[in-house]
């Protein structure tokens, strides 16, 4: 569903997008993800902030918690206990890193309509969750884990060694949160709540990144974060499991690390409970091309966890790193020993495999020159997954169902023909036993969320169709979008081109390349967006292009692993190649070509500007990496190896932005960074600026005081206004 295009009769009522539209979020869309609480019931927070329970079978709805109760403690979030006797209410949200935050929690007793008094929770809490059955509570406070059998009970302290920036229990440290798990929690209840598993991260030997936070005080604060950069000492991780029924009986029991992993530096990558007495742990060598999946069983006699070598499954990559961005997680079948998992097949495409005994004997479930992306749910007779198979567009996502009860297994695309023009990029959310599911379509048309019967796939109702957005866009001249591919030297380069509303192939337009280009990323996706680049095309008449080159995902290992140990080479080459092809199309003004990117995209845009091709007149780098020696170990080493002489130090040195300072002389460069960036440290831009000054190269720069990697709030408005002025000046467009 795209708003109707311009007809001559309407032309004077139609208007272009404005920058204000974008900054105000005028054309943002809504999605609807049910908070499933059973096979047929879900919760949803209504527009007026009531918590409403919906029963799909009967069509009835029930307000289980009024907005009055929510407001009484300023709650912005909630969580119903599985026995439906209590609700936690979350307030005083205080963001920390990407996922982590602290909050104050209140427990509301649904049986008497009052808040639980006595043995209240401490504040602020770092993480809190209900057990999967009943109403036990686990929470993390000051880096230690606590357990309550019932909300009104006194807490049982599970760990005692938690210390800020030193020992983290039940929550990840910075690098595990951002690059490995990636979640705000590191504790996992067993399916019926008998056991609680948790990770302990020891950061005592990790070097600390320190930066100033200016605030309003006379003296700036210093933020200290244990942050392992490439080659530095890493966190030491241990996994423990405690019996929550009798927590004091034997205490936490450590789960052994597989011998082949423990022989050198390693990571823990995920934990999956199979049953109450069987758990699956995934481990990864520091050189991230070997992953081990270890299935462990509870020994009642010894009260310990046993991980036999016969239940270790090794996943190894010979051409790159293990997995895609992360090593995939197993989805266990009902027999509680076999599982489904996505990994590379012999042709180098990520596909679903069924592992019963050994990885070598894995049965391949999907195959083809496309990739399986996510396994949503396995039931007794069906497996639901997403892939980009349909019509061979890698930037699409459709949901499929494979029948696993019958032989041969039959495959059905659930979404391919539902709303074919409007919807080509889906995700799904399933109720218990996949009795029902919600589909969330992200585009290319206006997003829509729908509810479906899990047996027949029949649509039951529309959950959110963004009618207001559709109406608001009726008089807007949106740019045209096309997704196509270039074939260059046996490489397929998919691109998205965003064209001005009255695009005319016989005219010449300025071109802006928007790049991310990081390993296992994808920019060319069939999704809806009205954003800054939509405005640049609609109002300012620019052509914008996004190109997925080597190193990007979901098109096979050949493209993905091409950048292994060589970051900053092929990603840049492929952007340049695409620009040359765009020029050949005849509608690009070759004297007005720019490139911009954020984060990894800032790195690529900087290298492209400094490539010496003369293609780019100007460009912008927002919060760029400038040297891989400055970035996090887990991410960087996955793709680059170690910065040591006997490993890959040479390419670490060759791939810096600073090494190309001289080449910025003939381009207009705008460098932007937040001073409180915990992720890509301000250090990166400081070093670029220093190198440019030392080379006596002129450039423009903007810093955002006390802003992190997201440059949010008022900084966002300033940022996009500033970048707009820069580009309009570069392209000689009148203000």
């Amino acid at each position: 569903l795209r708003p109707s295009r311009v007809h001559n009769s309407e032309e004077n009522t139609m208007r272009a997008l404005t920058l204000k539209d974008i900054l105000n979020g005028t054309f943002s869309y809504k999605t609807f993800f049910p908070n499933w609480i059973s096979g047929q019931e879900y919760l949803h927070q209504s527009a007026d902030n009531n918590i409403v329970l919906y029963n799909i079978e009967t069509g009835q709805s029930y307000t289980i918690l009024s907005n009055r109760t929510m407001k009484s403690v300023n709650a912005s979030n909630y969580g119903l206990s599985p026995d439906r006797q209590f609700v936690y209410l979350e307030s005083d949200y205080s963001k920390l890193w990407r996922y982590s935050y602290t909050a104050t929690y209140y427990i509301y007793d649904l049986s008497n309509g009052e808040f639980v008094r006595g043995n209240e929770l401490p504040r602020p809490i770092q993480y809190l969750c209900w057990s999967p059955v009943g109403s036990k509570l686990a929470y993390v406070y000051q880096n230690n884990i606590y357990l309550k059998q019932r909300p009104g009970d006194p807490p049982f302290q599970i760990t005692f060694n938690g210390r800020e920036n030193k020992i983290f229990n039940g929550i990840p440290d910075w690098v595990y949160e951002e690059e490995m798990l990636p979640t705000k929690y590191a504790l996992w209840w067993s399916p019926n709540g008998k056991f609680l598993a948790y990770a302990e991260f020891n950061d005592k030997d990790i070097p600390v990144i320190a930066y100033s936070y200016y605030g309003d005080e006379q003296y700036p604060r210093t933020i200290n974060i244990p942050y392992p950069k490439a080659g530095a000492k890493n966190p030491v991780v241990r996994i423990f499991i405690i019996d929550t029924t009798y927590p004091a009986y034997v205490g936490p029991q450590e789960v052994p690390v597989p011998a082949m992993i423990a022989s050198s530096d390693y990571y823990f990558s995920w934990l999956t409970w199979v049953t109450d007495e069987r758990v699956c742990l995934q481990w990864l060598k520091r050189v991230q091309n070997v992953s081990v999946l270890s299935i462990c069983d509870f020994r009642e006699d010894w009260q310990t966890w046993d991980c036999p070598k016969t239940q270790e499954h090794i996943e190894e990559s010979r051409t790159g790193w293990a997995g895609g961005f992360f090593v995939s997680r197993p989805v266990f079948s009902y027999d509680a020993i076999s599982y489904y998992k996505i990994f590379s097949d012999k042709d180098g495409y990520k596909h679903i495999h069924y592992i019963k005994d050994t990885v070598e004997n894995a049965i391949q479930i999907t195959s083809g020159k496309w990739e399986a992306i996510n396994i949503f749910r396995v039931t007794q007779d069906s497996l639901f997954y997403s892939s980009n198979e349909f019509e061979e567009y890698p930037g699409r996502r459709n949901i499929y169902r494979i029948s696993i009860g019958s032989y041969p297994p039959s495959k059905k695309c659930v979404t391919c023909h539902l709303r074919k023009e409007r919807c080509q990029y889906y995700t799904a959310s399933f109720s218990d036993y996949a009795k029902y599911y919600a589909l969330v379509c992200y585009g290319p048309g206006i997003p829509i969320s729908t509810l479906h019967d899990g047996r027949t796939d029949q649509e039951i109702k529309i959950l959110e169709e963004n009618k207001e957005l559709e109406n608001a866009l009726k008089n807007i001249q949106l740019p045209k979008e096309e997704i196509k591919k270039l074939e260059v030297d046996e490489i397929t380069l998919w691109y998205k081109m965003i064209l001005p509303p009255q695009f005319d192939r016989s005219k010449k337009y300025p071109l802006l390349i928007q790049v991310y280009g990081g390993p296992c990323s994808q920019s060319v996706r069939s999704v809806f967006a009205v954003n800054w680049i939509s405005y640049l095309a609609s109002k300012e008449g620019m052509v914008i292009a996004l190109v997925d080159g080597r190193g990007t995902a979901f098109q096979g290992d050949k493209l993905l692993y091409a950048v292994y140990r060589k970051l900053g080479v092929y990603e840049v080459e492929d952007q340049i190649t695409a620009v040359r092809k765009f020029i050949e199309m005849g509608f690009i003004d070759e004297k007005r070509i720019a490139i911009w990117g954020w984060s990894y995209g800032g790195y690529v845009s900087s290298l492209a500007l400094a490539s010496g091709t003369g293609l780019f007149k100007c460009g912008i780098a927002v919060a760029p990496v400038s040297s891989w020696e400055y970035y996090a170990s887990v991410y960087t080493e996955r793709f680059m190896g170690l910065p040591t002489k006997d490993d890959n130090l040479e390419h670490y040195k060759n791939s810096t932005v600073m090494a190309r300072a001289e080449y910025f002389r003939n381009v207009d460069y705008l460098l932007i960074h937040g001073t409180a960036d915990d992720n890509v440290h301000f250090q990166n831009s400081a070093q670029i600026a220093k190198a440019l000054v030392n080379a006596q190269v002129d450039f423009q720069a903007m810093w955002y005081s006390d802003q992190n990697h997201g440059l949010s709030g008022l900084s966002t408005n300033h940022l996009y206004t500033h970048m707009t002025h820069f580009l309009k000046q570069c392209f000689s467009l009148s203000d």
Epitope: S38, E41, N55, T58, L80, D83, R84, L110, S111, N112
Partner: nanobody, 123 residues
Framework: QVQLQESGGGLVEAEGSLRLSCAAS????????MGWFRQAPGKERELVAA???????LYADSVKGRFTISRDNAKNTVYLQMNSLKPEDTAVYYC?????????????????WGQGTQVTVSS
């Protein structure tokens, strides 16, 4: 084991009122959550109202403000006062019980049931 017996159903005109009663056997009545369900011909049995052991109530949005559930633990009885009745309220009304929380709307979560009482609202 709880035995339940409904009464108070009948024929009533639109906008009229009825009061349903459900008498329960068993000494631990006070510890059970109690609910009223209804089933119209060809439709699923749906929860109309529920009351927890602590007296907290839950209503279907379609009856909120018109129906009131209450309990008398001394008499082992739960009531459903139905006002401003509409033709679409016509159904067999069932009393149900469960140990634990009241905030369950699926039929399968309520193990104990009465025989039902017919309520007919004429227009």
């Amino acid at each position: 084991q709880v035995q339940l017996q409904e009464s108070g159903g009948g024929l009533v005109e639109a906008e009229g009122s009825l009061r349903l009663s459900c008498a329960a056997s068993g000494r631990t009545f006070g510890s059970y959550a109690m609910g009223w369900f209804r089933q119209a011909p060809g439709k699923e049995r749906e929860l109309v109202a529920a009351i927890s052991s602590g007296g907290s109530t839950l209503y279907a949005d379609s009856v909120k403000g018109r129906f009131t559930i209450s309990r008398d633990n001394a008499k082992n009885t739960v009531y459903l006062q139905m006002n401003s009745l509409k033709p679409e309220d016509t159904a067999v009304y069932y009393c149900a019980a469960r140990s634990g929380g009241a905030y369950y709307t699926a039929r399968v979560d309520w193990p104990y049931w009465g025989q039902g009482t017919q309520v007919t609202v004429s227009s």
